[in-house]
């Protein structure tokens, strides 16, 4: 019996069909196929568990929170012993293992590993102020996602014709910040943030007063 | 309560320059915040939103009517204008003019608006 | 052709429940918040729903706005005649980098 390599990583968006792919030949006919997927979760690596069984011609659930999501790809017994798993969690991303047996047939490997990552685009970003916004004074324009699997990158730009921001400003796309330096009237106006990964882009709006001191009267 | 109206040509012959004013009262047009808009809307049709100005002066223009708008303020007047240059009959619409606020949205609302004026291109 | 997708119109008894829906993506819809300004004949828009779901001061609670992935819906409860007028959803679009609106609905109080 010999196990087929396996792509060896499956990405897939959250809330999207997963298959998680495993074939093997064998000498034997399939009358005592037994198919066990487990996986180690990443949040979880000590924690394995049984994703689904196939055996003695039947198929069982595994860990509870697998059930009615998870299914062999086609009829069984196969050779094909793909699984997939619907509505993908966050939770679901890590090494799954398929363990084939087809008694009599023993030796080679039995075993198939696929990664599984669950990618998350951005949630909506907050975009917020720190810093006085008086005349001269420095400001950090923040923006970040709580949620984003690859971590997103942040682009921060200045919504007016020419979508740059103001000279004295530095961007750090990776902390999604923007400090501007002895702020001015032009630094004034709407700025845009765009959170960004593989699979999707969200944005916040951010509206900057620079506060001009009041003429004093005598 | 801010109001806004509309003036201008109601008619306004092909290749020449739309020139409409948005005179804005119960407000000034230079209180931060406020980003003053014009949005127009064909015959029978959807809404578009054509760009906007800041008091300051900064604008920022629709990418796909940029090249032939140009939106200007008059803070001394408390109005604000709209220029469409090299119009076409594709260019009939009424025209709104808006103020845009971000308030504590993450993208903001138009509120309150002007009550439109007709902008026919014909010869 | 507008970037929103709205039905181009829509009907009701009085006292029905009508929605209105607005299709758009996910650089607009599906990652911005949603407005919906109602337009009563020979009048400008106003805004009706911002924020997706919040009523400004003043709009009935007979209103109320939802979104889901890159759709967003307009609920009317207890239709009223004075309720028949054109109704548009507008987002933000993160590709365009600007405002974006549906081509509108008319509703009709039968």
């Known amino acids: 019996l010999e196990v087929s390599e396996s792509p060896g990583s499956v990405q897939v968006a959250r809330g999207q069909t997963a298959v998680l792919p495993c074939a093997f030949s064998t000498s034997a006919a399939l009358l005592n196929l037994n198919v066990i997927w487990m996986v180690i979760p990443l949040s979880n690596a000590n924690q394995p568990e049984q994703v689904i069984l196939y055996q003695g011609g039947q198929m069982f659930d595994g860990a509870l929170r697998f059930h009615g999501r998870v299914g062999f790809t086609g009829t069984m017994p196969a050779t094909n012993v793909s699984i997939f798993i619907n509505n993908t969690q966050l939770s679901d991303t890590g090494t799954y293992q398929c363990l084939v047996n087809n008694l009599p047939d023993r030796g080679g490997r039995n075993i198939g590993v696929t990664g599984l990552t669950v990618l998350v685009p951005p949630s909506a970003p907050q975009c917020q102020i720190q810093g006085s916004q008086d005349l001269g004074s420095d400001v950090i324009l923040l923006c970040s996602s709580e949620e984003g699997i690859p971590r997103p990158t942040y682009l921060w730009e200045k919504l007016d014709n020419t979508l740059k921001l103001p000279p004295t400003a530095t961007q750090d796309q990776v902390q999604g910040t923007v400090t501007i330096r002895n702020i001015s009237a032009l630094s004034s106006g709407l700025y845009q943030c765009v959170a960004s990964n593989a699979i999707g882009t969200s944005t916040c709006l951010l509206d900057l007063q620079v506060i001009s001191p009041q003429p004093r009267s005598v | 309560q801010v109001q806004l109206q509309e003036s201008g040509p109601g008619l306004v012959k092909p290749s020449q320059t739309l020139s409409l004013t948005c005179t804005v009262s119960g407000g000034s047009i230079s209180s931060g915040g406020y980003y003053w808009s014009w949005i127009r809307q064909h015959p029978g049709k959807g809404l578009e939103w054509i760009g906007y100005?800041?008091?300051?002066?900064?604008?920022y223009y629709n990418p796909s009517l940029k090249s032939r708008v140009t939106i200007s303020v008059d803070t001394s007047k408390n109005q604000f204008s709209l220029k469409l240059s090299s119009v076409t009959a594709a260019d009939t619409a009424v025209y709104y003019c808006a103020s845009w606020s971000l308030g504590t949205s993450n993208h903001g609302w138009f509120d309150p608006w002007g009550q439109g004026t007709l902008v026919t291109v014909s010869s | 052709q507008s970037v929103l997708t709205q039905p181009p119109s829509a009907s009701g008894t009085p006292g029905q429940r009508v929605t209105i829906s607005c299709s758009g993506s996910s650089s607009n819809i599906g990652s911005n918040t949603v407005n919906w300004y109602q337009q009563l004949p020979g009048t400008a828009p106003k805004l009706l729903i911002s924020?997706?779901?919040n009523r400004p001061s003043g709009v009935p609670d007979r209103f109320s706005g939802s979104k889901s992935g890159t759709s967003a819906s307009l609920a009317i409860t207890g239709l009223q005649a004075e309720d028949e007028a054109d109704y548009y959803c507008?987002?933000?679009?993160?590709?365009?980098?600007?405002?974006?609106f549906g081509g509108g609905t008319k509703l009709t109080v039968l």
């Open positions: 507008q987002s933000y679009d993160s590709n365009l980098s600007g405002w974006v």
């Open positions: 924020d997706n779901n």
């Open positions: 100005i800041y008091y300051s002066g900064s604008t």
